[in-house]
Every structure is written in C-alpha cells, then in structure tokens.
C-alpha cells in the first residue's frame, strides 16, 4: 500500500545499492516496557515438554549472545511426572533477524542475517507411519 | 571481550553518531540452507497446546507483516482429545529485533527495535495458590 509522503528529513538515498543498503540506529528502542521480564522464565521447568537454555555467543553478530532451547526429553511428562514416549517433545523454532559484521570485524558495517533459533519446546502427538 | 583487529577495508566511520548509526545491507543472508522448510509447520495443530497464527501489519516496520501465535485454549488437549483445564496452554514469548523506519516514512533509515512476539504455545502445570 501507499505510505505517507516521504519525510523531507530522510537521509540521502542516492546509494547505488538503495534501498538494499540502509542506515540503522543501533540505540535499541524497546516497545515492551510494560511486560514482566519473568514472563516465561519458569515455563521451561513447568512445561510437559521441559527444556534447558544454552548460551550461544558470536562476537561478529549483533546481538552477540543468544540463548537457545534444547528439549530435555524425547517424550513428554505425564500426570505422574514420568516421561511418556507415546508423545514427543519438539523444539519450536523461529528464524530471527540479527546483524552480521560485514566485512568481518568492521564496527559500523553490517548485513542482515536470518538465523534459526529454538525458543522453547511443545508436546505433540507423533506422526505414526504404518508399514504395509 | 577483545575483538579481532579492525579490517582496513571497513567503510568510513567519521559520522558524528558513530558507532550508533551503522550501514546495513538488507540483502538477507540465510545461514539455514540445509534445513527442511516443512520443519515445524504442523506443530501448531499437533501440539497438546495448539495455537493459531494471527496477522499483524505495520508499514513502518521491517518486516511489515508478522504472523504471531495465539493459544487456542486455556487448557491443554488430553489423550481423549478434550481440553483439560487442570493444565494451561501458555505462549512462549521471545524478544526479536526488527527495524523501525526513523524518521517515520523514510525508505532508507531505520532504528533497531525489540518487540515481543509469541512464537508458539506449550502446556504447563498451573501454579496453584492456596488460600489460608
């Protein structure tokens, strides 16, 4: 759709790569000011498909630290607190935007990158393949 | 920590806002080339805490269109296929980076922004508060 007329205060866009190369202000604005930081911090333990969080660090990436979920069990926790292997714990994966320094080790030049992260786990009914 | 020495081929950084304003190439690089695109597409239906995706549009954001998860039930689906309200379906939320046009309506100038998105749902044991 059409957006409002271009703001006359916009930076110059005569770059030959425009609009593929853009200016980005890294002072992150957080729109989640009224959210509770402990919001889902205990779901990893209380879930029927519990998970652990693992630290992933990469100094050439922004953000440099990302926490990744790994399901604790192949099955899911039943009402008795035991692992039920008739159900499956699976990671919910998401592709997220990060900035990758490009050229490498440059402090002020980045490229957008999509990386796949596991955010948590959910319990699903398995797909059963019947052999004829 | 200490980063690798600066690459001599880096773009000029004499901007008065450096290093807060950087150049970003929007030609997204995907590091997940060997993954199966159908990987998690049916978990939303097979989960004991199923979810639907809802469309959210914002032309001042990049990406402009985001489909977000909303849990279908308060409870979780039991072995009989019924909703068990002794358990809770809860959204797994994550903060992700997006780009916000700044100044508004500029095609080539952005600010990094963190937004909270619900990625999927998981089934958790409820926290029971006993009244004295």
């Amino acid at each position: 759709g059409i957006t409002i007329p271009r703001n006359p205060g916009c930076p110059n866009s005569e770059d030959k790569n425009f609009p593929r190369t853009v200016m980005v202000n890294l002072n992150i604005h957080n729109r989640n000011t009224n959210t509770n930081p402990k919001r889902s911090s205990d779901y990893y333990n209380r879930s029927t498909s519990p998970w652990n969080l693992h630290r992933n660090e990469d100094p050439e990436r922004y953000p440099s630290v990302i926490w990744e979920a790994k399901c604790r069990h192949l099955g899911c926790i039943n009402a008795d607190g035991n692992v039920d292997y008739h159900m499956n714990s699976v990671p919910i994966q998401q592709e997220i935007l990060v900035l990758r320094r490009e050229p490498p080790h440059c402090p002020n030049s980045f490229r957008l990158e999509k990386i796949l992260v596991s955010v948590g786990c959910t319990c699903v009914t398995p797909i059963v393949h019947h052999v004829a | 920590g200490i980063t690798i020495p600066r690459n001599p081929g880096c773009p000029n950084s004499e901007d008065k806002n450096f290093p807060r304003t950087v150049m970003v190439n929007l030609n997204i690089h995907n590091r997940n080339t060997n993954t199966n695109p159908k990987r998690s597409s049916d978990y939303y239906n097979r989960s004991t805490s199923p979810w639907n995706l809802h469309r959210n549009e914002d032309p001042e954001r990049y990406p402009s269109v985001i489909w977000e998860a909303k849990c279908r039930h308060l409870g979780c689906i039991n072995a009989d296929g019924n909703v068990d309200y002794h358990m809770n379906s809860v959204p797994i939320q994550q903060e992700i980076l997006v780009l916000r046009r700044e100044p508004p309506h500029c095609p080539n100038s952005f600010r990094l922004e963190k937004i909270l998105v619900s990625v999927g749902c998981t089934c958790v044991t409820p926290i029971v508060h006993h009244v004295a």
Epitope: T3, Q94 | Y44, V65, I66, W67
Partner: antibody, heavy 132, light 110 residues
Amino acid sequence: EVQLLESGGGLVQPGGSLRLSCAASGFTFSHYEMLWVRQAPGKGLEWVSVISPSGGGTHYADSVKGRFTISRDNSKNTLYLQMNSLRAEDTAVYYCARGSESFEVSSSWYGGWDYYYGMDVWGQGTTVTVSS
Amino acid sequence: QSELTQPPSVSGAPGQRVTISCSGDTSNVGKNAVSWYQQLPGTAPKLLIDSNNQRPSGVPDRFSGSKSGTSASLAISGPQSEDEADYYCAAWDDSLSGVVFGGGTKLTVL
C-alpha cells in the same frame, strides 16, 4: 513467469459445496501469504480469506466465516478454498492473489521480506454460480 | 467500516490530472499501507500502486499515490484511453483482521 491459475468453479445448488484450487508457478509459493478475493456480477471486489505462508494462520470475511475454509499444500504449490453451505449471494468470480512475503514467528521461511507489498499477482478467476 | 469510501466515478481529459480519493479510518488506511488496483473490463485486477508509492514494473509513471491521515488518493496525470477502467483501493484492517476494499471508481477518459 509468475502465474496463478484457478479451477473448480461451476454451478451448484444452494446448500451445496465446491472446492476451488489455485495452482501457483514461477515463484517460491511457501514464502508468501495467499488470498481469495471475489467479485459478484456487476459489483466491486470483496476480500474472502487470507492464509499465512505455512498455513498456520487464517482469517476470513464475516460473510463466509464458518462456511469457507482456506488451505494450502506447499509441496504442490496449490491454494484451496473449500466452500460449504453455499448461498445465492456467494455467486461471483473468485480470484486467488499473492500477498506479502511475510514473517511467521513459529516457522522457518526462506526469502527476504518484501520491502514493498500488495496483492501483486492475480489469477484469471473462476466463476461460481449458486442457483436452484 | 466494512468498506473504504471511493467516488463511484471520475472523468478527465488526456491533458488533465485526475485524482481518485479513498477514505478509511484509523484501523485501516490510518495505520496500514494502502494499495491501488486497476481492473480493465472483463479482466482480473492488476496491482497499480504498492507500498511506499512504488509502481510495479510496467505501470506508467503517470500513476502516483499518496496518503494523509485516514485518506489516500490515486493521481493520474494525463489519462489515456487505455486507462478507462475500474480502480480499487485496499488496506489491511486491524479491527476486522482482514482486507478492506474500496467500492471502486470508474474512470472515463473524455
């Protein structure tokens, strides 16, 4: 060449059912949200439904909610519209259209996000006539 | 509102500038992007103006779009006979969780 080809229209009695198909070619179907739009004889365009890239998200116009079901098979590059309990007022030419290359938080996708978007590809339409 | 508001018809000579208005509210035009579609008689609609006022390849530069508040407009500078068609605006509506179209405007080239 990017193309959408609808089929499945025809004459049906009130209360009957029809299933429309839309075969996509020339683009990566699984990256895009897809829509159905209809046009009654001598009338304007009316949006019917939209589906997210993985199929996990759907929205419907109030006029068809509970009667029509949108779905997709990304392995076959095909979009569907199952129409039940058809009424005389459903008589129209039905078009499928390609929407935004959008971001789904709970599934992986493989394109860059559309910098500009809209229903940029339309099929030729298939006619549905509901009459006794 | 379930439909965006457009004038039923407009007309203009090849030397004139013709504008088609599209009025909505804060849940559609006021917040989200507006796109414009051209439908020639007996054919499927075609995207004419996309977000950020972009014209898909093949759309002549005599077509342009703008938006202010809850209203958008399509301008045709020097309409040609081949531009005689129905024109529709559309936007995503947050309240309805769906796309809303305008009622359509028939352009007659004098």
